[in-house]
Amino acid sequence: CDLPQTHSLGSRRTLMLLAQMRRISLFSCLKDRHDFGFPQEEFGNQFQKAETIPVLHEMIQQIFNLFSTKDSSAAWDETLLDKFYTELYQQLNDLEACVIQGVGVTETPLMKEDSILAVRKYFQRITLYLKEKKYSPCAWEVVRAEIMRSFSLSTNLQESLRSKE
């Protein structure tokens, strides 16, 4: 399944919007830094693009869920957040077509499911962290930076798989 050329552009726009959303300096939040244990290997050990796409879809779905809570709405600029939703929604649509098209073509569907579970657990850790930090501005800034990093890593891995093929 070939993703539209606009998908890569959408990923870049998503990262750009995440960068623009920054409200405070991460340096003022050093005491709140946290290792969320991004499951990078779940994007790197899937040898076929068809196996990575559902995992990337899950990643974007979870980002969408995280930023569409009422606590998130209170933390970020509404206009930027709306643009961010639009970008994520478009990417989910692109990937969904490939997920449906790729059903049954993966080498080990249960490996893919374990990867999806690993992504869900990663976001559970992020949600728990925000809750424990009472959704403070610094906690949200740490999470924003983390999502930028993990989203960038996962899309880069997806791109490198695409270029290999």
Epitope: Q48, E107, T108, P109, M111, L117, R120
Partner: antibody
Framework: HVKLQQSGAELVKPGASVKLSCTAS????????IHWVKQRPEQGLEWIGR????????KYDPNFQGKATITADTSSNTAYLQLSSPTSEGTAVYYC??????????WGQGTTVTV | DIELTQSPATLSVTAGEKVTMSCKSS????????????LTWYQQKPGQPPKLLIY???TRESGVPDRFTGSGYGTDFTLTISSVQAEDLAVYYC?????????FGAGTKLEIK
């Protein structure tokens, strides 16, 4: 503490349908996959199918396609198995199991269905 | 569909003995991407639901005694109990965790003499 609580035993007339429930506590079903497994008296285990409660996507063993329907309600943290028009072959213990980490790592206590 | 053949059907042993049971798959359960074998072992004691023992052919589930060891690669797998205890009386099932539909072996019944 992770637990899967299944509904009570069912006595069903052949041809009638029955809906079994599996309620999770200690975790969100939308963060996992829920499987259903059948075990006839003194027999082995047969996989029926599974659901990803986060999106409702299901997979079934071809032998159960059309005879069993798996659904989930994330608001009540419950998964369901509906058996339509069962025959005497449907007499069995039905287990729900969740894939929280790897494989089917948590199991319900089982529901006995007698047709 | 992947077929799993377990042997023997029944094992009758004395407490303290070492036992091995076999599970053979009709096709390879090895994933080339992560080099893991997608075979799982479950233990089912009388009147209880199955319990996960081993996943990825050799990884012991947390809380499972270290007398249980899973081994094997590709199509041939083994579950070993180094020193059988009375509480190990159960049926042991292997399961294809590689592809849908998921399939189970017919089971090996462990009896204690």
């Amino acid at each position: 503490h992770v637990k899967l609580q299944q509904s009570g035993a069912e006595l069903v007339k052949p041809g009638a349908s029955v809906k079994l429930s599996c309620t999770a506590s200690g975790f969100n079903i939308k963060d996992t996959f829920i499987h259903w497994v059948k075990q006839r008296p003194e027999q082995g285990l047969e996989w029926i199918g599974r659901i990803d409660p986060a999106n409702g996507y299901t997979k079934y063993d071809p032998n159960f396609q059309g005879k069993a329907t798996i659904t989930a309600d994330t608001s009540s943290n419950t998964a369901y198995l509906q058996l339509s028009s069962p025959t005497s072959e449907g007499t069995a213990v039905y287990y729900c199991a969740s894939r929280v980490d790897y494989a089917m790592d948590y199991w319900g206590q089982g529901t006995t269905v007698t047709v | 569909d992947i077929e799993l053949t377990q042997s023997p059907a029944t094992l009758s042993v004395t407490a303290g003995e070492k036992v091995t049971m076999s599970c053979k798959s009709s096709q390879s359960l090895l994933n080339s991407g992560n080099q893991k074998n997608y075979l799982t072992w479950y233990q089912q004691k009388p009147g209880q639901p199955p319990k996960l023992l081993i996943y990825w052919a050799s990884t012991r589930e947390s809380g499972v005694p270290d007398r249980f060891t899973g081994s094997g690669y590709g199509t041939d797998f083994t579950l070993t109990i180094s020193s059988v205890q009375a509480e190990d009386l159960a049926v042991y099932y292997c399961q294809n965790d590689y592809s849908y539909p998921l399939t189970f072996g017919a089971g090996t019944k462990l009896e204690i003499k």
